[in-house]
């Protein structure tokens, strides 16, 4: 269940996909990745107000309980719903190899 | 990849399973659920310090970028890794029915 996509906090403030440019140095990969040397990291950032992009019933429960017990129960959190694979060309003992990582770049976001 | 399970913030402070008791009124279910009248809601609560229970490479990247750009990139978030099913007995137009919900109670937690 993907509930409301309308953000009550104003445009761009709620859970959505953002792109952050990062160097291999930023990621701690400089010594083993040859290409790309710079990564466009897609990640899920933003607030999860009531029922916004609720991933499932657990997220809906969390919203209800957060409203009642905000000090105990946190609001739902903006996380990846799916991923885009990323291809890294990396150094190996014998030379170089092509490696795909399936859980590296967020493709779509929801609140949970 | 499930990284370190040792919490550097002290016992019970990091991402883990918590149980929160909630009534049907709390959950907004009073008008359609007959049983149970009270639910032991298991949810994931707690901090996600560096590499603690990192769900995947995306979580590891998020940790690295949060360290570099804390105002732009949030820390990973404590969310369910899996769920326990829950059976609800609910009112229907014709009487009552037994319904299983697979995405309601957190079973295990990780940081993402």
């Amino acid at each position: 269940a993907r509930n409301g996509d309308h953000c009550p906090l104003g445009p761009g403030r709620c859970c959505r996909l953002h792109t952050v440019r990062a160097s291999l140095e930023d990621l701690g990969w400089a010594d083993w990745v040859l290409s790309p040397r710079e990564v466009q990291v897609t990640m899920c950032i933003g607030a999860c107000p009531s029922q916004f992009r609720a991933a499932n019933m657990h997220a809906q429960i969390k919203t209800s309980l957060h409203r009642l017990k905000p000090d105990t129960v946190p609001a739902p959190c903006c996380v990846p719903a799916s991923y885009n694979p990323m291809v890294l060309i990396q150094k190996t003992d014998t030379g170089v190899s092509l490696q795909t990582y399936d859980d590296l770049l967020a493709k779509d976001c929801h609140c949970i | 990849a499930r990284n370190g399970d040792h919490c550097p913030l002290g016992p019970g402070r990091c991402c883990r399973l918590h149980t929160v008791r909630a009534s049907l009124e709390d959950l907004g279910w009073a008008d359609w659920v007959l049983s149970p009248r009270e639910v032991q809601v298991t949810m994931c609560i707690g901090a996600c310090p560096s590499q603690f229970r990192a769900a995947n490479m995306h979580a590891q990247i998020k940790t690295s970028l949060h360290r570099l750009k804390p105002d732009t990139v949030p820390a990973p978030c404590c969310v369910p890794a899996s769920y326990n099913p829950m059976v609800l007995i609910q009112k229907t137009d014709t009487g009552v029915s037994l319904q299983t919900y697979d995405d309601l109670l957190a079973k295990d937690c990780h940081c993402i």
Partner: antibody
Framework: QVQLVQSGAEVKKPGASVKVSCKAS????????INWVRQAPGQGLEWMGW????????AYAQELQGRVTMTTDTSTSTAYMELRSLRSDDTAVYYC???????????WGQGTLVTVSS | EIVMTQSPATLSVSPGERATLSCRAS??????LAWYQQKPGQAPRLLIY???TRATGIPARFSGSGSGTEFTLTISSLQSEDFAVYYC?????????FGGGTKVEIK
């Protein structure tokens, strides 16, 4: 925007060598590798190899090993592919293709026709 | 090396009709598959990567599906500009390999 501009068509004799260039612009050259792909007339696409514009590390197709050399010049943002001991079946359009983090690439040079004929 | 086999070699379709192109890998390539369109005298153009993700600027009538060894490119309603040769490409392992192509021609 990303652009890859290749050198002009070449006609070579069997046994000779050819060196095709690929000048990149619109991005940081050493951030991505360059693949070389060729296409014989009326045929499909064949991957020849890859070079890191950052380190110069290479990976070549096995059947071309020993005949092909890929290099880069970061000062001019140019990649080169040299093929030696040319044969008639090396007649093809040669493309340079930039890496992307997603695998498939929208960034191809316009192609260089190399004709090997006696 | 991974062998990519495309079928049919030629597909005759009327404008406005649906076209379904197949690509089979000799071993699993997961979702590491791209589709390209090539017109005479031009470089290939990326349509789909990750088996199902449309590249920037590619119309919604192009869709990709499949994983492992069986993949499909579907063009929901052929436009005149879609008549071309289509190639699948695996990038799961080196050497990168391409299928032999499917020519989509006007019926």
């Amino acid at each position: 925007q990303v652009q890859l501009v290749q050198s002009g068509a070449e006609v070579k004799k069997p046994g000779a060598s050819v060196k095709v260039s690929c000048k990149a612009s619109g991005y940081t050259f050493d951030s991505y590798g360059i693949n070389w792909v060729r296409q014989a007339p009326g045929q499909g696409l064949e991957w020849m190899g890859w070079i890191s514009a950052y380190s110069g590390d290479t990976a070549y197709a096995q059947e071309l090993q020993g005949r092909v050399t890929m290099t880069t010049d970061t000062s001019t943002s140019t990649a080169y592919m040299e093929l030696r001991s040319l044969r008639s079946d090396d007649t093809a359009v040669y493309y340079c293709v930039r890496d992307t983090q997603y695998g498939g690439s929208p960034y191809w040079g316009q192609g260089t026709l190399v004709t090997v004929s006696s | 090396e991974i062998v990519m086999t495309q079928s049919p070699a030629t597909l005759s379709v009327s404008p406005g009709e649906r076209a379904t192109l197949s690509c089979r890998a000799s071993q699993s390539v997961s979702s590491n598959l791209a589709w390209y369109q090539q017109k005479p005298g031009q470089a290939p153009r990326l349509l789909i990567y990750g088996a199902s993700t449309r590249a920037t600027g590619i119309p919604a009538r192009f869709s990709g599906s499949g994983s492992g060894t069986e993949f499909t490119l579907t063009i929901s309603s052929l436009q005149s500009e879609d008549f071309a040769v289509y190639y699948c490409q695996q990038y799961n392992n080196w050497p990168i390999t391409f299928g032999g192509g499917t020519k989509v021609e006007i019926k």
